[in-house]
């Protein structure tokens, strides 16, 4: 009893400590650690039935998918997978958890968002944070130097997500990557083409793909006077330019990150520029930037990339944006991010980005991190932010009040009179065996009205009605639910007629 009282006091004290730290705006890491301690204390306390009733809910940052949401999701996945396959990708899968060591040192500041699993008999494990690092591990482990693959799976991040904006702790990523030594910018251009094809097919609104290159960023920081040790942290400040003003970014770089104001101003002259191939040409003439080897390589590759994007017919969707500085540590070359555009309030205003829906880039060093000899396998890829897309599609369908079918049933086997259950069971079985998606109501003697109502609600287009007279005549009454039109179909022709009406191929190939 004393033990429980002590633990209860500790839980109370720890709760106060957490609240205090939040009020003081203590570092996120410290708050996270103290919250984790609080949870461990509570776990030791265990349930006290007299005090607390278990709240039935999904864990923070997760959700269930209803049949309606799943229908949306499957449609989205279908568009994406068809595109990936059209571009000749193979598919792989990897474990949901990896050895902790595999994920360590690959994500920079984001490493603190990795979920560690409680030790299970010796191996220190973590849930995967993305699909790219496991892919690199897969390549290194199998000594592969060449593959074009896609991978659709859930990833896990200990984020504090704004779920209303389609962000979660468990979410799907849809990745497409090309690994191998190829001529410059051809695979990169294809990745951007894929991104544009998918976003256009999904019809979620106008979008823009921002493109930059890690080498240009690094070269620019070098000529502006940023020390190597500050590159990554300054990158993360610059990357905020799509959300906040240059003034705020500059204040962060100078005030919080210790950058000299004149260095920040030099960076500002560059990162506030965006345009097309003409900006690439302009920067190639820049007296300082063109003297930097890294930047020059990056600009040369971008010039080539824009040529290919023009040939692919998507150059109008691409913007060279010097403020794009994607957070992950492993990018080495071209980087890109697709944002949806809000229609401007007034004509003449610049379109406003409403958040990233796809992103990617070149990461030539990641596989080498896993290879004992450090052998590199150049890679480039993209990731579609499907959770964001699900949210947008769901909202759009709700706004349109569109009915979404959650099943694919083509026909309901119904009866007009009593005592026909055996006949319904025989017919539904025949239909299933012929590859028809069919259902029946689980009642011996259902009312015809109830059966028709069920079809209306479930969006089932056809009803196959069995009656005593129809049985004698060897026919089935086939009724269209929407037009209410009925025709007698010979039983042996029923399968073919249903397939014809529902546009299904006549053989199950």
């Amino acid at each position: 009893m004393a033990e429980r009282a002590a633990l209860e006091e500790l839980v109370k004290l720890q709760g106060e400590r957490v609240r205090g730290l939040k009020q003081q705006k203590a570092s996120a890491e410290l708050i996270e650690e103290e919250v984790a301690k609080l949870l461990k204390l509570k776990a030791q306390l265990g349930p006290d039935e007299s005090k607390q009733k278990f709240v039935l809910k999904t864990p923070k940052g997760t959700r269930d998918y209803s049949p309606r949401q799943m229908a949306v999701r499957e449609k989205v996945f279908d568009v994406i997978i068809r595109c990936f396959k059209r571009h000749g990708a193979e598919v792989i899968d990897t474990p949901v958890f990896e050895l902790k060591e595999t994920l360590m040192g690959k994500y920079g500041e984001d490493s603190k968002l990795i979920y560690d699993l409680k030790d299970q008999g010796g191996e220190l494990l973590s849930l995967r944070y993305d699909l790219t690092v496991p892919f690199a591990r897969y390549l290194a482990m199998n000594k592969l130097t060449n593959i074009k693959r896609y991978h659709i799976a859930k990833v896990y991040r200990r984020d504090n997500p704004a779920m209303t904006r389609g962000r979660y702790r468990e979410f799907y990523q849809c990745d497409f990557d090309i690994a191998g030594n190829f001529d410059p910018m051809i695979p990169d251009a294809e990745c951007l083409k894929i991104m544009c094809e998918i976003l256009s097919s999904l019809q979620i609104g106008d979008f823009l793909v921002k493109v930059n290159d890690r080498r240009i960023l690094d070269g620019m920081f070098a000529i502006c006077g940023v020390s190597d040790s500050k590159f990554r942290t300054i990158c993360s400040s610059v990357d905020k330019l799509d959300k906040v003003s240059w003034e705020e970014v500059k204040n962060e770089m100078v005030g919080e990150k210790g950058l000299a104001p004149e260095v920040a101003d030099r960076i500002g002259d560059y990162v506030q520029q965006h345009g097309g191939v003409s900006l690439v040409e302009q920067l190639l003439q820049d007296p300082k930037l063109s003297q930097n080897k890294q930047a020059l390589e990056g600009l040369g590759d971008l010039k080539l990339l824009f040529e290919y994007l023009t040939l692919f017919g998507i150059d109008d969707k691409i913007s060279f944006d010097l403020s794009l500085a994607r957070g992950l540590d492993y990018y080495t070359g071209v980087i890109y991010e697709a944002v949806l555009l809000q229609t401007p309030a007034q004509a003449g205003e610049e379109p406003l980005g409403v958040g990233s829906v796809a992103a990617g880039g070149r990461y030539d060093g990641l596989v080498g991190m896993f290879d004992p000899k450090g052998r590199k396998v150049p890679c480039v890829g993209l990731s579609i932010g499907v959770e964001r897309i699900f949210s947008i599609v769901e909202q759009r369908l709700e706004a349109l009040e569109e009915k979404i079918r959650t099943t694919e049933t083509q026909v309901l086997v119904a009866s007009a009179q009593k005592k026909l259950l055996e006949e319904r069971l025989k017919l539904v079985s025949e239909l299933w065996d012929a590859g028809i998606k069919a259902e029946l109501l689980y009642k011996k003697n259902p009312k015809l009205l109830n059966q028709l109502q069920y079809c209306e609600e479930a969006g089932i287009p056809l009803v196959a009605i069995i009656g005593e007279q129809e049985l004698k005549d060897g026919v089935i009454k086939l009724r269209s639910v929407t037009s209410r039109e009925e025709v007698d179909v010979r039983r042996e022709d029923l399968v073919e007629e249903i397939k014809r009406r529902t546009g299904q191929p006549l053989c199950i190939c």
């Epitope: 002590a6 633990l7 006091e9 500790l10 004290l13 106060e16 400590r17 890491e29 650690e33 984790a36 301690k37 461990k40 204390l41 030791q44 603190k112 560690d116 409680k118 030790d119 220190l124």
Partner: antibody
Framework: QVQLVESGGGLVKPGGSLRLSCAAS????????MSWIRQAPGKGLEWVSY????????KYTDSVRGRFTISRDNAKNSLYLQMNSLRAEDTAVYYC?????????????WGQGTLVTVSS | DIQMTQSPSSVSASVGDRVTITCRAS??????LAWFQQKPGKAPKLLIF???NLESGVPSRFSGSGSGTDFTLTISSLQPEDFATYYC?????????FGQGTKLEIK
């Protein structure tokens, strides 16, 4: 019963290195935060470093930060302290200690200590 | 860093006496305080945690009180085995710091 046994102490020259180990038994090691606490001869106690149950969090007192590294191997029920660039003022008995109620920074269980002497 | 100051530095007392040792924190630490007993050549032993909770197996003659910045350890009736050095420690924020110790000697 809970047992913590330190090893690895000894005499080392200034600038040298030592690795202390602590073998734990009698409890579920992977559930507990662990720490190293030291006591210079005839002096008080100083909390040197701690490590969380999964190694996600580690902290060091200012005087050792950058020179000492705390680590653990949950599979082996072992805690370690890698001490580099040792100084005369690091001379002390080093205790391995287990947190109270898994996460409370109060040393509930202590080892017998291992003496580290830094001297030329 | 939070400084912990114990008083007195040493105290002489006899078996059966009531002894009080105080500990002051340089800033508020709520109830995040522990008391330890250490005998020569041995590791410290936990007596009291979060200011007033008696560690299991510790005799009830030991008690702790206080919160914020001022704390006390009281031994209601000294026993021969209680002669040792006593330390307080704050567990509020890292670096966790100990008092300089109070040596309890036989009068």
């Amino acid at each position: 019963q809970v047992q913590l046994v330190e090893s690895g102490g000894g005499l080392v020259k200034p600038g040298g290195s030592l690795r202390l180990s602590c073998a734990a038994s009698g409890f579920t090691f992977s559930d507990y935060y662990m720490s190293w606490i030291r006591q210079a001869p005839g002096k008080g106690l100083e909390w040197v470093s701690y490590i969380s149950d999964s190694s996600r969090y580690t902290k060091y007192t200012d005087s050792v930060r950058g020179r000492f590294t705390i680590s653990r191997d949950n599979a082996k029920n072992s805690l370690y302290l890698q001490m580099n660039s040792l100084r005369a003022e690091d001379t002390a008995v080093y205790y391995c200690a287990r947190y109270l109620y898994q996460v409370i920074a109060i040393a509930k269980s202590w080892g017998q200590g291992t003496l580290v002497t830094v001297s030329s | 860093d939070i400084q912990m100051t114990q008083s007195p530095s040493s105290v002489s007392a006899s078996v059966g006496d009531r002894v009080t040792i105080t500990c002051r924190a340089s800033q508020g630490i709520s109830s995040w305080l522990a008391w330890f007993q250490q005998k020569p050549g041995k590791a410290p032993k936990l007596l009291i945690f979060v200011a007033s909770n008696l560690e299991s197996g510790v005799p009830s003659r030991f008690s702790g009180s206080g919160s914020g910045t001022d704390f006390t350890l009281t031994i209601s009736s000294l026993q021969p085995e209680d002669f040792a050095t006593y330390y307080c420690q704050q567990a509020n924020s890292f670096p966790y710091t100990f008092g300089q110790g109070t040596k309890l000697e036989i009068k």
